[in-house]
């Protein structure tokens, strides 16, 4: 519900400018570390690293998609699977890793010039089991790329990372989605978590910049699972 989403300090897919649709988990963002959910009358932190069975792509991390683990398997036992890298086979956009999309059954880079003007994509945002909007954008909308002319600067409302200028990604903040800076070395990042029935996160960080990966900070190895600090580190 919106209540579980907004009574929180953490976010996932966001809505675009002026009434477009919300994005699927193709945006390269990571959730904030202390994801807060309402528990009774006070905020409660839930840190969940367990693998998560899923019903749809939106329940998985931004670098995952929802599918049966076995080819042609029972759709009733779907789980979050690692996204497909460039040139790998795909059936839909969500199967491809952030920065790519599915074209003719193959994951290709969304950076290619023809991409933005070529597709009109129908996208859906969901909160738990409810189909809803967080800043209210239409829940199922065909969004034309023609809406976007210039790349969004930091703080601009966006739909996906390709709407943002270089060095920025599109990430949710409360009830909307804005261009935020890609993380630099040493900055706190977030490992993706499975999203169950808690509602989507409402505060997202961007991914780590080029040549960096989100890894547990060395001096935090001894810390408990729920307080492990991840930072962007050189490969």
């Amino acid at each position: 519900t919106l209540n579980s989403v907004l009574n929180s300090n953490a976010i996932k897919n966001l809505p675009p400018p002026l009434g477009g649709a919300a994005g699927h988990p193709g945006s390269a963002v990571s959730a904030a570390p202390g994801i807060l959910y309402p528990g009774g009358n006070k905020y409660q932190t839930i840190d969940n690293y367990q693998p998560y069975p899923c019903a749809e792509d939106e329940e998985c991390g931004t670098d995952e998609y929802c599918a049966s683990p076995t080819r042609g398997g029972d759709a009733g036992v779907q789980i979050c699977l690692a996204c497909r890298k460039r040139r790998k086979r795909c059936m839909r956009h969500a199967m491809c890793c952030p920065g790519n999309y599915c074209k003719n059954g193959i994951c290709v880079s969304s950076d290619q010039n023809h991409f933005r003007g070529e597709i009109e994509e129908t996208i859906t945002e969901s909160f738990g089991n409810d189909h809803s909007t967080l800043d209210g954008y239409s829940r199922r909308t065909t969004l034309s790329s023609k809406m976007y002319h210039t790349k969004g600067q930091e703080g601009s409302v966006c739909l996906r990372s390709s709407d943002c200028a270089s060095g920025l990604c599109c990430a949710r903040h409360f009830w909307s989605k804005i261009c935020k800076p890609v993380l630099k070395e040493g900055q706190v990042c977030t490992k993706h978590r499975r999203k169950g029935s808690h509602g989507l996160e409402i505060f997202q960080r961007c991914y780590c910049g080029e040549g960096l990966s989100c890894r547990i900070q060395k001096d935090h190895h001894q810390a408990s699972n729920s307080s492990r600090l991840h930072t962007c580190q050189r490969h």
């Epitope: 519900t1 919106l2 209540n3 989403v5 907004l6 009574n7 929180s8 300090n9 400018p17 002026l18 009434g19 909160f127 409810d130 189909h131 809803s132 909007t133 967080l134 800043d135 209210g136 954008y137 239409s138 829940r139 930091e154 703080g155 409302v157 903040h173 409360f174 009830w175 909307s176 804005i178 409402i202």
Partner: antibody, heavy 117, light 107 residues
Amino acid sequence: QVQLVQSGAEVKKPGASVKVSCKASGYTFTEYTMHWVRQAPGQRLEWMGVIDPSNGDTSYNQKFKGRVTLTVDKSSSTAYMELSSLRSEDTAVYYCARTTGPWFASWGQGTLVTVSS
Amino acid sequence: DIQMTQSPSSLSASVGDRVTITCRASQDISNYLNWYQQKPGKAPKLLIYYKSRLHSGVPSRFSGSGSGTDFTFTISSLQPEDIATYYCQQVHTLPPTFGQGTKLEIK
């Protein structure tokens, strides 16, 4: 253009409830969340809560939880804020506000609610 | 909740003056700061969002800067119509919270 028109001033007795309306026009009502903010005389603005008109989902400031109820009527593009168990310190101007990002871009004109015995 | 403290609470300036208002957050709020203008008997009006982005239709004499916990709102050349109370608002953490306001008057 976007317009949010609120209902008129109200005078209520302590312990009573008040329901303020906010009629939206100039945009698709279900496509933007509606927030409620109040301002007591000479005081700072205070966020009360938010409702998603598309499905009625709500989130409230913990300070008001249990006393405030946000609802919408999609057919008339109207949002409502009901505050119960009124006390004198609830005397304030109540605003509805629509967002486009994490900021309040459009506001209603405000509704003065006076709580007095 | 994050506490927002504005200073000064009120100030008097002449037309054409450069006016500066500061806003301090009780914890780091990155760039998630908005500024609103409110005239007597009217609803607040968004001027600046995300620390320094000018809302559409807002004159360029208004600007914002800062980061982390300390922020500044500036009117480069005060105009008579700028007489109002100005509020900062953090949207880093729920619930969104506002400063107590700075009342701006003409000398």
